[in-house]
């Protein structure tokens, strides 16, 4: 005890009353109002507790402190008086703070600040929404992936910041009267081919596809080495000539010179040169067959191989070249009798007749074109009388049943063997190279030299054998009728044709004379 009679043992946050008692300081309380033992403590009174008599008033919060309390304006409010703290409702001057005015960038981009009592909210602009993890941040709404499908199916949706566009897909354009961008955009396919917006090489033909286009090799052309067909960057080369080279194993200067000419014509060939090129090839062939030179010294079999090779190649080359001709009828004839008749048309539904000096061909136009082939329809007939020299003594191979029929009703082949070629050799071709089984037959009328009485006349075609040579055959060809100097043949395929006179001893009254082979 001190000399003034004040207890020295008073607990923290208390003051002595006298030498034996203490009292808690204001803002603190103990179990009993007067403290008489040092074991008692003074605890802070929470003036802000619910049952407390302290009232700070509206828009404010009570903050308890050690031994006291403070009233402060709630977040979003501030005191008009400027005093940061106060003690009771009567001192409360708290009013709402307009955060939006205080900080115009509060809602960052794409949002509008809206003041609320004690706070603010961000209202997002159209095309934006509040980010869940940051409700004050507006982020772009991706209308394209939100499942709203705001665009027409002919367009594709492009998300923009705060918006979206419905744009025509590549290779499409707005239909007449439609915008390109708004959600009411409707598009249609652009035909790049007819509008000239394509970049196809001159060696190709442009094909429109939905939303795009492709470049396909012209008929008779092939993709350049290593470049695929049917692409936008396809470049092609003419293949009409590349495969028509001398047959292997045949050594003939005359033939080599012919093929040199063919290769020369092919080297700088262009589609516009088709007419001149056809004429030049036939001119060269006519000259070759008029003066075969050392070809005539070759063994017969080799001559047949050369003829086979010439007929086969000529057909391919003429088919390829004629696809580049303009519509119309062409007739060319050459000094040694070679003759070409050609008709080129956009497909028409009628029959076509090609007339030549020694042959007439009649067939249905719709055979000419392969379905899906964009080029013109071509029907061609070449008469090659000079080919007869190379085909002398060429064998005739009959189907077993025809062979049997002839042997039963005739005396059989006479000893001198090989049939005689009565007519010019003709070659028929179409733009469609699939001519092995025509849906309607082709009719040929041949003019030829006189038939020796009691000899069998046969309509034949040249069958290219596996060995690169060939023989005369009758499969698919029938003799419709024959007079002394003309014969009508009907065939279900195209190739090179002729009329042969076979050395059968036919009995004059023999009814088999009228049998169609």
């Amino acid at each position: 005890q001190d000399s003034r009679g004040c207890a020295r043992w008073c607990p923290q946050d208390s003051s002595c009353v006298n030498a034996t008692a203490c009292r808690c300081n204001p803002g603190f309380s103990s179990f009993s109002e007067i403290i008489t033992t040092p074991m008692e403590t003074c605890d802070d009174i929470n003036e802000c507790a619910t049952l407390s008599k302290v009232s700070c008033g509206k828009f404010s919060d009570c903050w308890n402190t050690e031994g006291s309390y403070d009233c402060v304006c709630s977040p979003g409010y501030e005191p008009v008086s400027g005093a940061k703290t106060f003690k009771n409702e009567s001192e409360n001057t708290c009013q709402d703070v307009d955060e939006c005015q205080q900080n115009p960038r509060l809602c960052k981009s794409y949002g509008t600040c809206v003041n609320t009592l004690g706070s603010y909210t961000c209202q997002c602009l159209p095309g934006f929404k509040l980010k869940p993890e940051d409700p004050k941040l507006c982020t772009d709404v991706n209308e394209c992936t939100s499942g709203q499908n705001p665009c027409h199916s002919s367009t594709h949706c492009l998300n923009n910041v705060g918006s979206y566009q419905c744009r025509c897909r590549p290779g499409w354009q707005p239909i007449p009267g439609s915008p390109n961008g708004p959600n009411n955009t409707v598009c249609e396919d652009v035909d790049e081919c007819s509008s000239g917006q394509h970049q196809c090489d001159s060696s190709t033909v442009c094909f429109n596809t939905v939303g795009s286009y492709s470049c396909r090799c012209r008929p008779g052309w092939k993709p350049r080495h290593g470049i695929p067909n049917n692409q936008k960057d396809t470049v092609c080369e003419d293949m009409t000539f590349s495969t028509w080279t001398p047959p292997p194993g045949v050594h003939s200067q005359t033939l080599s010179r012919f093929f040199d000419k063919v290769q020369d014509l092919g080297r700088d060939y262009k589609p516009g040169l088709a007419n001149n090129t056809i004429q030049s090839i036939l001119q060269a062939l006519d000259e070759l067959l008029e003066a075969p030179g050392d070809l005539e010294t070759l063994p017969r079999l080799q001559q047949h191989c050369v003829a086979s090779h010439l007929l086969d190649g000529l057909e391919d080359v003429l088919r390829g070249l004629s696809k580049n001709l303009s519509n119309g009828l062409l007739n060319f004839s050459y000094p040694a009798g070679t003759e070409l008749s050609l008709e080129v048309q956009k497909q028409v539904d009628r029959s076509v007749t090609l007339r030549q000096n020694q042959a007439v061909m009649q067939l249905d136009w719709n055979q000419a074109q392969k379905s899906g082939d964009p080029g013109p329809s071509v029907v061609g007939l070449v008469s090659i009388p000079g080919m007869g020299k190379l085909l002398a003594e060429a064998p005739l191979v009959l189907e077993p049943e025809k062979q049997m029929l002839l042997h039963e009703t005739h005396q059989g082949l006479l000893q001198d063997g090989s049939p005689i070629l009565l007519s010019d050799v003709i070659s028929a071709f179409l733009s469609n190279n699939d001519t092995q089984n025509l849906s309607s037959p082709v009719t040929f009328t041949f003019s030829h030299r006189s038939v020796i009485p009691r000899q069998k006349v046969l309509c034949v075609f040249w069958e290219h054998g596996q060995n690169g040579c060939g023989h005369w055959a009758t499969t698919g060809c029938s003799t419709i009728g024959t007079r002394d100097t003309s014969t009508i043949c009907r065939c279900t395929h195209l190739s090179s044709f002729a009329v042969l006179m076979a050395h059968y001893d036919v009995q004059e009254e023999d009814p088999v004379l009228t049998v169609i082979t």
Epitope: S202, D260, Q263, D268, K270, L273, N276
Partner: antibody, heavy 118, light 106 residues
Framework: QVQLQQSGAEVKKPGASVKLSCKAS????????MQWIRQAPGQGLEWIGA????????RYTQKFQGRATLTADTSTSTAYMEVSSLRSEDTAVYYC???????????WGQGTTVTVSS | EIVLTQSPATLSASPGERVTMSCSAS?????MHWYQQKPGLAPRRWIY???KLASGVPDRFSGSGSGTDYTFTISRMEPEDFATYYC?????????FGGGTKLEIK
Amino acid sequence: QVQLQQSGAEVKKPGASVKLSCKASGYTFTNYWMQWIRQAPGQGLEWIGAVYPGDGDTRYTQKFQGRATLTADTSTSTAYMEVSSLRSEDTAVYYCARGFTAYGMDYWGQGTTVTVSS
Amino acid sequence: EIVLTQSPATLSASPGERVTMSCSASSSVSYMHWYQQKPGLAPRRWIYDTSKLASGVPDRFSGSGSGTDYTFTISRMEPEDFATYYCQQWSSNPLTFGGGTKLEIK
């Protein structure tokens, strides 16, 4: 009838360029190559190159590669030849001619005289 | 390139005479053409494809040959035939002309 009409005579300084024209008529312009040939005074014929009007494809002799440019305008059926970096030895008569491998050059223009002199 | 050598370079002849000139190629040629040129005029195609006479060319002119050797012949010289004759090939690029044979009056 087939005609090839060439532009008039030109006088140029060394280093300059000249562009000659050859207007075709009487045939389908795209069905033949257009050849360009020159002939220096007292000399023989020298091929420069050829252009195919159908697709603009060109062929040049090595000597003129990069210095001569052959073009064709199908809308006017006119072929052009431009020769750059002219030298005095380019003084010659320049001819255009219609050509095809098997037929040779069957029609010729009347020729354009180009004189290169300082 | 294929070099065409014409011989002779100059040929003197009299009207009525038979004249032959040749064109030799450094490699085989399949299409050979011949042109006639008179002073101050453009050349004219005279013979094409070795032996075919161009339109309007008299039949006293003829051509022959194959491979590397070609010949141009005038069976009976006429006064209007005096000119320079050129051979030409386009069997391979570049197209080439021979140096010409000048046919002059003896």
